[in-house]
Amino acid sequence: ALDTNYCFSSTEKNCCVRQLYIDFRKDLGWKWIHEPKGYHANFCLGPCPYIWSLDTQYSKVLALYNQHNPGASAAPCCVPQALEPLPIVYYVGRKPKVEQLSNMIVRSCKCS
Amino acid sequence: ALDTNYCFSSTEKNCCVRQLYIDFRKDLGWKWIHEPKGYHANFCLGPCPYIWSLDTQYSKVLALYNQHNPGASAAPCCVPQALEPLPIVYYVGRKPKVEQLSNMIVRSCKCS
């Protein structure tokens, strides 16, 4: 699987999950989140050659088409597969609230 | 929705479904499919700016990150959303067989 265990410990050139730290204030302009100040969101990057973690029958076909037509702009793309939530603390007035923001952290990628 | 109805009738620059015809023999090297000789597979293409058909909370965050960091390689990607099957005819010797190949045609796209 193209997950953090594999991707973070390898020098994989093809589609894989990459490290990305997002600072809520600096990178998103969000001031409402009190904790954490930022988080390891990660992102997906890398080419999707034939047979590289292809998502559907269509992505197999498209990767194969791309192999036969290397100049074509039609190609599968490396996108998130498994996402995890992020617990955050924000304030309503002086009252802290805990919330789970769903689908915030990329754990693995796929070619779609 | 970024579907064929909207995308094929517009000059949309952002993520949208685009027309692509695939010839089974020429583009894939498949000789075993008798009918059709090829099909309109379509593909997804175009940038994914903030709020453009974003798939998850993560893709919203990433698009926003990208807006704040325009040079970053981390950005959502335009990928298939709705896929449809393709009925095909292949031969087992002289005997024709009908099969549905699932997830073969792109009907709409999303930013993931």
Epitope: Y50, I51, Q57, K60, L64, Q67 | L28, G29, W30, K31, W32, Y90, Y91, V92, G93, R94, K95, E99, L101
Partner: antibody, heavy 120, light 108 residues
Framework: EVQLVQSAAEVKKPGASVKVSCKTS????????ISWVRQAPGQGLEWMGG????????NYAQRFKGRVTITADESTSTTYMELSSLRSEDTAVYYC?????????????WGQGTLVTVSS | ETVLTQSPGTLSLSPGERATLSCRAS???????LAWYQQKPGQAPRLLIY???SRAPGVPARFSGSGSGTDFTLTISSLEPEDFAVYYC?????????FGQGTKLEIK
């Protein structure tokens, strides 16, 4: 270069199952149909079935139906032939071969063969 | 299933001679569903002819195939020492694919 590389020889007891693998070069796996043929010692050739790896559509010879399963693993470009309820008459060299492109077709590239011996 | 009968069972000839191998099908195969293979001891079969008469890539011109319907022939115009082997015909018109029992071509 086109190559089909098969797994090593196996010795099995009657009633057991055997799974023979056939690793192919990517292009063959993507575009062709893989057939399995066996040859008992000193005997002729017998077709067991075949698979279209890309879509996992399999076709079997009637006499092996229910006993043979042919599958494909795209991540490794490998095709597998599993034969169950083995009996002594299943002792043979098992070959994988790529067809010229159709489901039933002539076979242009062959693996080196895997000897399966069924003996108590 | 389609039964293929090859004749003769064994053919004894000398290098330089012409070899004619026959394959008869129990039902019509049309004109393009027959192949011929060569097999040497301890080796996998090698495709010689497909579609009854088309030579596979890399196969010498001395090998030729002919026939349609139920009667097919493999001809080796002038035998070379490396041609002595077992030859099989194969039909792929109908499932299951079937092979002939083989013709052994031996040096006289």
């Amino acid at each position: 270069e086109v190559q089909l590389v098969q797994s090593a020889a196996e010795v099995k007891k009657p009633g057991a199952s055997v799974k023979v693998s056939c690793k192919t070069s990517g292009y063959i796996f993507i575009s062709n149909v893989i057939s399995w043929v066996r040859q008992a010692p000193g005997q002729g050739l017998e077709w067991m079935g075949g698979v279209i790896p890309i879509v996992d559509i399999a076709n079997y010879a009637q006499r092996f139906k229910g006993r043979v399963t042919i599958t494909a693993d795209e991540s490794t470009s490998t095709t597998y032939m599993e034969l169950s309820s083995l009996r002594s008459e299943d002792t043979a060299v098992y070959y994988c071969a790529s067809t010229l492109g159709l489901v039933l077709d002539a076979m242009d590239y062959w693996g080196q063969g895997t000897l399966v011996t069924v003996s108590s | 299933e389609t039964v293929l009968t090859q004749s003769p069972g064994t053919l004894s000839l000398s290098p330089g001679e012409r070899a004619t191998l026959s394959c008869r099908a129990s039902q019509s195969l049309g004109s393009s569903y027959l192949a011929w293979y060569q097999q040497k001891p301890g080796q996998a079969p090698r495709l010689l002819i497909y579609g009854a008469s088309s030579r596979a890539p890399g196969v010498p011109a001395r090998f030729s195939g002919s026939g349609s319907g139920t009667d097919f022939t493999l001809t080796i115009s002038s035998l070379e020492p490396e041609d002595f082997a077992v030859y099989y015909c194969q039909q792929y018109a109908d499932s299951p694919i079937t092979f002939g029992q083989g013709t052994k071509l031996e040096i006289k």
